[in-house]
Amino acid sequence: KFSKQSWGLENEALIVRCPRQGKPSYTVDWYYSQTNKSIPTQERNRVFASGQLLKFLPAAVADSGIYTCIVRSPTFNRTGYANVTIYKKQSDCNVPDYLMYSTVSGSEKNSKIYCPTIDLYNWTAPLEWFKNCQALQGSRYRAHKSFLVIDNVMTEDAGDYTCKFIHNENGANYSVTATRSFTVKDEQGFSLFPVIGAPAQNEIKEVEIGKNANLTCSACFGKGTQFLAAVLWQLNGTKITDFGEPRIQQEEGQNQSFSNGLACLDMVLRIADVKEEDLLLQYDCLALNLHGLRRHTVRLSRKNPIDHHS
C-alpha cells in the first residue's frame, strides 16, 4: 500500500513523486529505506529531496532501492514508498520491456502520444521524438507541448516511440528519455451497440478467501477500428481508479479480433488476497461506445471446500 514503481536510466535525470498524497507546502521527509538514512534537501547533492519530489540528478545504478517519504504534520504523518530501479543504458537500439511505459493506441482520427512522466520535470519545448531509435522527420510528425501528433496514421506507424527532453535544475541540464509502444487501429469497418461476451449477466463467480481472483470483461463493438470504444470495471458504481482499493486493479487485455472479424476488447479485474468484504461489492462490467452503454453485473460468492468422502 502507498508504494509506486519508478525507473530510469543511469546518467539521466529521474524525478519521483511521493506516492502518499499530501498537499503542496507540507514538509516531506525522504529516507533511503535500507539504511533509514535521511535524503538531504540541499540541491548541491546529486540525489536530493525537494518537497514531494525526490530528484536524481543524474541517476546511478547504485541508487536503486526503496525510498520512504513521510508527509509530516503534528497530528498526521503519511508514509509512502518509492521503489526505484536505475538501469544501465543499452548499447543496442532495443528498449527492454522493463523500461517501457504503458502502450497507447491511435487511429487516423486520434494519434496523440504523450511523453510519460514529463509533468514532473522542468523542461522546455520542443521535445525530441524517436521511433525505434530513429529521429522522426517529416511534416507528418508534430511535437506539440508534451505529446507527439502523427498525421494520416498508417499501420506502419506502430512501434516504440521515445521522447527525449532536457530537465533544467539551477542552470544545469540533464537528459531524460521515456519510451512507450504505439499501436494503430484499422479505420475500416462499422460499429454496433456493445455486445458483452463475458461475464454473463448476473453471473455468480466463486472465489476463495485469501486467494487471488480474476474477472474478465470482454465485449465486441463492431468491425475494424472503433472510435470511442471501451470496457471497464466498476465497483459499487465507482470507477476502479476512484474506488482506491489497492488490492483491486484492472488491467487492459489484448485487443481481440475473432474469426468473424469483430473488434473486441478485454479488461481483466485482478483481486489480490480476496477478503470477506469483497463478496459484498457489486462488480459491473461496462462496455460503451457511441451507440451506448451495456452493463453486466457480477457478484462474488465463497467457494466451499470440496468434501472428500472415503
Epitope: 498524497q21 514538509t27 509530516r72 504534520s73 503534528p74 498526521f76 476512484d242 482506491g244 489497492p246
Partner: antibody, heavy 117, light 111 residues
Framework: QVQLQESGPGLVKPSQTLSLTCTVS?????????WNWIRQPPGKGLEWIGY???????TYNPSLKSRVTISRDTSKNQFSLKLSSVTAADTAVYYC??????????WGQGTLVTVSS | DIVLTQSPASLAVSPGQRATITCRAS??????????MHWYQQKPGQPPKLLIY???NLESGVPARFSGSGSGTDFTLTINPVEANDTANYYC?????????FGQGTKVEIK
C-alpha cells in the same frame, strides 16, 4: 472527486443515541485520508467531534469522548457516528468531512438533527 | 484545548474594498517552520469550504482575492477586492494538536 453524504434520523429523543451515517463516493475510505464528523448548533460555530482514519484508527474530541463512537462499514464505503445520552444541546447540523492532511478538504451537505421529546 | 478567537464578530465591506479578519490562538500553532492554521468560508445553507491551509496556502480553485498570513498565535485572512458573492461566515481552524478547534466565526456582509 470525493463526495460525502450524511444520512440518519432528523429527530432524536433526549437520553437516546443519535446515529448518523456518511456515505462516501469517488474514493475508498480504506485507501487514505481521515474521515471526520463536525457539528454546528443552529446559528453557532463549528465543533470537531472526531475522526476515523483509513486504517480504522479513531481519535475523538475529549469533550465528547465518553459519548462518541465512530465506526465504518468498508463494504458499503460508509463511516458512522453514534452519540449517546443526547440532550437538547446536541441539536445541530452534523457534517462529515474528509481530511487529506490536517484541513477539512471535502464536506458533506450536512444533516440537521433535533433532540426533542 | 487551543482556543481560537476571531475578530471582528462581523463586518460590512463595500465591493472592491479590502476585508480583514483576524484569528488569535491561545497558544502557538506553529512548529517546524509551518503554521497549522486553516480558513473556511461558509455561505448560508451550505457546508464550509476550505480557502486557505497552513496559514497562507491557497486551496486549489480558490480565487487569488483570498490570502492568509501570520504565524505563532496571530493570523489574518484578507479578501481584496471583496465581491458581492463573498457574503458568508468565515472560520479559522487549527490542527496543531488534538482536539482540532474552530474560531467562533466572522460574518462578512457586502454593503
Amino acid at each position: 472527486q470525493v463526495q460525502l453524504q450524511e444520512s440518519g434520523p432528523g429527530l432524536v429523543k433526549p437520553s437516546q443515541t443519535l446515529s448518523l451515517t456518511c456515505t462516501v463516493s469517488g474514493y475508498s475510505i480504506t485507501s487514505d485520508y481521515a474521515w471526520n464528523w463536525i457539528r454546528q448548533p443552529p446559528g453557532k460555530g463549528l465543533e470537531w467531534i472526531g475522526y476515523i482514519d483509513y486504517s480504522g484508527s479513531t481519535t475523538y474530541n475529549p469533550s465528547l469522548k465518553s459519548r462518541v463512537t465512530i465506526s465504518r462499514d468498508t463494504s458499503k464505503n460508509q463511516f458512522s457516528l453514534k452519540l449517546s445520552s443526547v440532550t437538547a444541546a446536541d441539536t445541530a447540523v452534523y457534517y462529515c468531512a474528509s481530511t487529506v492532511i490536517d484541513s477539512m478538504d471535502y464536506w458533506g451537505q450536512g444533516t440537521l438533527v433535533t433532540v426533542s421529546s | 484545548d487551543i482556543v481560537l478567537t476571531q475578530s471582528p464578530a462581523s463586518l460590512a465591506v463595500s465591493p472592491g474594498q479590502r476585508a480583514t479578519i483576524t484569528c488569535r490562538a491561545s497558544k502557538s500553532v506553529s512548529t517546524s517552520g509551518h503554521s497549522y492554521m486553516h480558513w473556511y468560508q461558509q455561505k448560508p445553507g451550505q457546508p464550509p469550504k476550505l480557502l486557505i491551509y497552513l496559514a497562507s496556502n491557497l486551496e486549489s480553485g480558490v480565487p487569488a482575492r483570498f490570502s492568509g498570513s501570520g504565524s505563532g498565535t496571530d493570523f489574518t485572512l484578507t479578501i481584496n477586492p471583496v465581491e458581492a458573492n463573498d457574503t458568508a461566515n468565515y472560520y479559522c481552524q487549527h490542527s496543531r494538536e488534538f482536539p482540532f478547534t474552530f474560531g467562533q466565526g466572522t460574518k462578512v456582509e457586502i454593503k
